[in-house]
């Protein structure tokens, strides 16, 4: 009874479980790769727990390995649009500070229409992700086609 | 050495570590696009820890924050088939209570014959989860290659 | 304030929060299908908390149901190279204790390059969790296409 | 308690090389990144590199690119920064400091510093 | 690279003064700033990280502000100790650069 007392009065901030699941804002203009996201429960099932977003970007806010998932549908697409738009690729990973930039993801679309993918990494305080979608075709905005989330797992 | 203690002597379930993973069990009748799922040990690793099954779909038991997963693989598929029966449709959403009605993740197989991902989103106690096919092809009820689950991850 | 001093003064490992991300080493020879891992900060950003390698698989320490995610990209890889050399396989499953031994995860490739899921399973302290990946195409050693992990997620 | 502790001063010729030696106690010293950062007299600091000394993966400046070699003995808990084919404006004292934060979350907030090693290039 | 510059190049004030210093980068690094203090002959020491977050066991009476390019040190209420030379280094982008240096000397 008293650990459940204890757990009720710290925040829960403080037990880290900062979580976040975006939905597809804008993709960017030309040259620029990235998707941008947005989030918020006025937007629909995104939040925001702790991450926050920095124009359109996730960063972390705490310390720790976290699961990073993702998963992208491409708009107005086919295995024929997809084969014949080759090479069409989706890449997650740090992009700020650029002095800790590194790539934790990648996966390409070949015949698909959709990827989706996830795995544990560590993040620090301050590092922001961003997610490069190459290639020329759109990202569907549906949010159930279309998110991007971490959930951090420990120290 | 309290805190450990505590920690024993408190059922899991008020840590809020409701999970489950489910196994295939059987198709709609035909007009149903539903998946039936079964669960529970004497079935192999599947399992129930607070959600559970109501006329093999999944009920939630406590609020929060939930990794939602699926993979779902054909029967009896190659990608030539795959694509001669496309659109073959797999979508995940709230089918109950009707007024919190919302398609969670949806994902098409274009030439593929496995689709999988997994995402955060926030349930409520009550909320029935429903997983859709939609097209002719039938899905494996092979248990490593189809399966649906969820884990309980923050309030 | 009682019970964030005791979780201060507990080590993590108490707390149960094994978990392990993999890149891949090496695949094994002929008539060998397993793939060989390897974790460690000294390599980037593979890790392993709790569970450890034993000749390239990874080995449970801790009873308890886990997330089990993994994906595998072939190397020199286009659609057309992966349906000529269909089928092209990764299974998942625990391969010893022998009177243990089950498949958990089963994925073809199909006209795609890359395959990626999650499942959550309980596994026992001993476990043995093997990765095989059946056909003639190699796996990329890029550690951003290739990964292999696990995270424990309640008793 | 951590430190780090460097090896003495040097007084070496143009053209030559010296090597730098810094060793850690009071943490284990494979888990923090060690920076390299050199202040010439009456100067500000100027950063010369890193080593991580887990993996002994390593970032020069492009400034010092084809001159420094960083290296470190995990085994003594030591790292060593060699600089070559030394100038009279490499004169400077030569510090090693550690990474606030562990390897995987390093930010390059030096929160340790070794006392610092004197090196004067001289004809 | 990116250039940071530090003003004033040196400052005097007094013992219980309130001391503002600022750093400013060639282009946006986010909080990607420390603040180190050297004394004559020392090594240098960690004060402020992340442009704003206080080094353990560093005084309350030193705070750090800011965010993109602009940010300033805080000292509010001078002590004696506190006469030395001060730094801001980025770590936005490689390679890692330091302010040229404010002075701060007794009046």
């Known amino acids: 009874q008293r650990f459940a007392q204890a757990q009720q009065q710290l925040p829960l901030e403080s037990l880290g479980w900062d979580v976040a699941e975006l939905q597809l804002n804008h993709t960017g203009p030309q040259q620029d790769p990235r998707l941008y996201w947005q989030g918020g429960p006025a937007l629909g099932r995104s939040f925001l727990h702790g991450p926050e977003l920095d124009k359109g970007q996730l960063r972390i806010h705490r310390d720790g390995i976290y699961m990073v998932h993702i998963q992208v549908t491409l708009a107005i697409c086919s295995s024929t649009t997809a084969s014949r738009h080759h090479p069409t690729t989706l890449a997650v990973g740090i992009c700020s500070p650029a002095s800790r930039s590194i790539s934790l993801l990648r996966l390409s679309f070949h015949q698909g229409c959709t990827i989706a993918s996830q795995r544990l990494t560590p993040l620090a305080r301050g590092d922001t992700l961003c997610t490069n979608l190459t290639g020329t075709l759109l990202p569907s905005r549906n949010t159930d086609e279309t998110f991007f989330g971490v959930q951090w797992v420990r120290p | 050495q309290r805190f450990a203690q505590a920690q024993q002597q408190l059922p899991l379930e008020s840590l809020g570590w409701d999970v489950a993973e489910l196994q295939l069990n059987h198709t709609g009748p035909q007009q149903d696009p539903r998946l039936y799922w079964q669960g529970g040990p004497a079935l192999g690793r599947s399992f129930l820890h607070g959600p559970e099954l109501d006329k093999g779909q999944l009920r939630i038991h406590r609020d929060g924050i939930y990794m939602v997963h699926i993979q779902v693989t054909l029967a009896i598929c190659s990608s030539t088939t795959a694509s001669r029966h496309h659109p073959t449709t797999l979508a995940v959403g709230i089918c109950s209570p009707a007024s919190r009605s919302i398609s969670l993740l949806r994902l098409s197989f274009h030439q593929g014959c496995t689709i999988a991902s997994q995402r955060l989103t926030p349930l409520a106690r009550g909320d029935t989860l429903c997983t859709n096919l939609t097209g002719t092809l039938l899905p494996s009820r092979n248990t490593d290659e189809t399966f649906f689950g969820v884990q309980w991850v923050r309030p | 304030q009682r019970f964030a001093q005791a979780q201060q003064q507990l080590p993590l490992e108490s707390l149960g929060w094994d978990v392990a991300e993999l890149q891949l080493n090496h695949t094994g020879p002929q008539q060998d299908p397993r793939l060989y891992w390897q974790g460690g900060p000294a390599l980037g950003r593979s890790f392993l908390h709790g569970p450890e390698l034993d000749k390239g698989q990874l080995r449970i320490h801790r009873d308890g149901i886990y997330m089990v995610h993994i994906q595998v990209t072939l190397a020199i890889c286009s659609s057309t190279t992966a349906s000529r050399h269909h089928p092209t396989t990764l299974a998942v499953g625990i391969c010893s204790p022998a009177s243990r031994s089950i498949s958990l995860l089963r994925l073809s490739f199909h006209q795609g390059c890359t395959i990626a899921s999650q499942r959550l399973t309980p596994l026992a302290r001993g476990d043995t969790l093997c990765t095989n990946l059946t056909g003639t195409l190699l796996p990329s050693r890029n550690t951003d296409e290739t990964f292999f992990g696990v995270q424990w997620v309640r008793p | 308690q951590v430190q780090l502790v460097q090896s003495g001063a040097e007084v070496t010729k143009p053209g030559a090389s010296v090597k730098v030696s810094c060793k850690a106690s009071?943490?284990?010293?494979?888990?923090?990144?060690i920076y390299w950062v050199r202040q010439a007299p009456g100067q500000g600091l100027e950063w010369m590199g890193w080593?991580?000394?887990?993996?002994?993966?390593?970032n020069y400046a492009q400034k010092f690119q084809d001159r420094v070699t960083m290296a470190r003995d995990t085994s003594i808990s030591t790292a060593y920064m060699e600089l070559s084919r030394l100038r009279s404006d490499d004169t400077a004292v030569y510090y090693c400091?550690?990474?606030?934060?562990?390897?995987?979350?390093?930010?390059?907030?030096?929160?340790?510093w070794g006392q610092g090693t004197t090196v004067t290039v001289s004809a | 690279d990116i250039q940071m510059t530090q003003s004033p190049s040196s400052l005097s004030a007094s013992v219980g003064d309130r001391v503002i210093l600022t750093c400013q980068a060639s282009?946006?690094?986010?909080?990607?700033l420390h603040w180190y203090q050297q004394k004559p002959g020392k090594a240098p020491k960690l004060l402020i990280y992340?442009?704003?977050d206080l080094e353990t066991g560093v005084p309350s009476r030193f705070s750090g502000s800011g965010s993109g390019a602009d940010f300033t040190f805080t000292i509010s209420n001078l002590q004696p100790e506190d006469f030395a030379t001060y730094y801001c280094?980025?770590?936005?982008?490689?390679?890692?650069?330091f302010g040229q240096g404010t002075r701060l000397e007794i009046k």
């Open positions: 080593i991580n000394p887990n993996s002994g993966g390593t």
């Open positions: 280094q980025q770590y936005d982008h490689l390679p890692i650069t």
């Open positions: 400091a550690k990474d606030r934060k562990r390897e995987y979350y390093y930010n390059f907030g030096m929160d340790v």
């Open positions: 009071g943490y284990t010293f494979t888990s923090h990144y």
């Open positions: 992340d442009a704003s």
């Open positions: 282009q946006d690094i986010s909080n990607y």
